[in-house]
């Protein structure tokens, strides 16, 4: 399955929208920095495409879930959020189309399941942090910065997969 070129463009648009969503000066939020433990090893180049597609799908699904909450809607600009949802939804569709075409529908490797679990735990840590920080503006900015970084890293994986073919 070849992810369409539009998927790559969509990823870039997603990052641009995340950048535009900023609401406050970040300089006041230094002390709110936090180690969320992004499972970078789960996005390493050692995976086959059949293994990476479901992990990337999980990553984008979790981002969608995170920014679809009531607390998120209160934190961000509604128009930008709607555009953001649209981009993520399109990327999920692209990845799901690959799964339907037969990529990764054979016997599920244990490694892939572990990777999906690691991504879920990562987002649980982010959700817990927001809760502990009472969904403060700075906490949301720290999370937005973290999602930009982790999404960018996972996007780079998609690009490396495409260039290997």
């Amino acid at each position: 399955c070849d992810l369409p070129q539009t998927h790559s463009l969509g990823s870039r648009r997603t990052l641009m929208l995340l950048a535009q969503m900023r609401r406050i000066s970040l300089f006041s939020c230094l002390k709110d920095r936090h180690d969320f433990g992004f499972p970078q090893e789960e996005f390493g180049n050692q995976f086959q495409k059949a293994e990476t597609i479901p992990v990337l799908h999980e990553m984008i699904q979790q981002i969608f879930n995170l920014f679809s909450t009531k607390d998120s809607s209160a934190a961000w600009d509604e128009t930008l959020l709607d555009k953001f949802y649209t981009e993520l939804y399109q990327q999920l569709n692209d990845l799901e189309a690959c799964v339907i075409q037969g990529v990764g529908v054979t016997e599920t490797p244990l490694m892939k399941e572990d990777s999906i679990l690691a991504v879920r735990k990562y987002f649980q840590r982010i959700t817990l942090y927001l809760k502990e920080k009472k969904y403060s503006p700075c906490a949301w900015e720290v999370v937005r910065a973290e999602i930009m970084r982790s999404f960018s890293l996972s996007t780079n994986l998609q690009e490396s997969l495409r260039s290997k073919e």
């Epitope: 939020c29 230094l30 002390k31 920095r33 936090h34 180690d35 973290e146 930009m148 960018s152």
Partner: antibody
Framework: EVQLVQSGAEVKKPGESLKISCKGS????????IGWVRQMPGKGLEWMGI????????AYSPSFQGQVTISADKSISTAYLQWSSLKASDTAMYYC??????????????WGQGTLVTVSS | DIQMTQSPSSLSASVGDRVTITCRAS??????LNWYQQKPGKAPKLLIY???SLQSGVPSRFSGSGSGTDFTLTISSLQPEDFATYYC?????????FGQGTKVEIK
């Protein structure tokens, strides 16, 4: 390879203006902030200020607020430090360094080689 | 502003010695503390970030500890290339501030 390359040494007279530069390469320039640090001859490090090149938001140390201006041109991955009217006390080595912003990553992990500014009549 | 106080301001030691430099913040900075090494005519080099994380490429003889207001940089066995000036820096809030430096000289 990540690099921050600063402009060359400058010799200026009191009252003159100056703009020194710091060009980033080998990484996404807008994903990191750029900070400026002063070191006067034989003295320690003093943080001057910082810029987020993605939107040019700046923060200054109270000691340097109004004395210098920090700017950036993201199209050429370059940050700047400028003076409108130099004083003899501005004689120092000036360093730029990159900062990961709100990400949990090493602060000021890469530094420029420094720009020596000498102000003398 | 958060004031950073380093001690000692200078020390003399021999190759192989265990060296400890302390840094105290005027208020709690959690673990937002960095350590840098600077040699004459060179830019500072990051050694330790977030109080205890060793920067990539830095020898394991360097270690950092502490949280809140009191921090320590330890060189377990001083090497000839370690003779330099060391600075702590708080990364908790702006304005960022450095300690005054500790010069490690050859005894």
């Amino acid at each position: 390879e990540v690099q921050l390359v600063q402009s060359g040494a400058e010799v200026k007279k009191p009252g003159e203006s100056l703009k020194i530069s710091c060009k980033g390469s080998g990484y996404s320039f807008t994903s990191y902030w750029i900070g400026w640090v002063r070191q006067m001859p034989g003295k320690g490090l003093e943080w001057m200020g910082i810029i987020d090149p993605s939107d040019s938001d700046t923060a200054y140390s109270p000691s340097f607020q109004g004395q210098v201006t920090i700017s950036a041109d993201k199209s050429i991955s370059t940050a700047y430090l400028q003076w409108s009217s130099l004083k003899a006390s501005d004689t120092a080595m000036y360093y730029c360094a990159r900062h990961p912003g709100l990400n949990w990553a090493p602060d000021f992990d890469y530094w420029g080689q420094g720009t020596l500014v000498t102000v003398s009549s | 502003d958060i004031q950073m106080t380093q001690s000692p301001s200078s020390l003399s030691a021999s190759v192989g010695d265990r060296v400890t430099i302390t840094c105290r913040a005027s208020q709690s900075i959690d673990e937002f503390l960095n350590w840098y090494q600077q040699k004459p005519g060179k830019a500072p080099k990051l050694l330790i970030y977030f109080a205890s994380s060793l920067q990539s490429g830095v020898p394991s003889r360097f270690s950092g500890s502490g949280s809140g207001t009191d921090f320590t940089l330890t060189i377990s066995s001083l090497q000839p290339e370690d003779f330099a000036t060391y600075y702590c820096q708080q990364a908790h809030s702006f304005p960022l501030t450095f300690g005054q430096g500790t010069k490690v000289e050859i005894k």
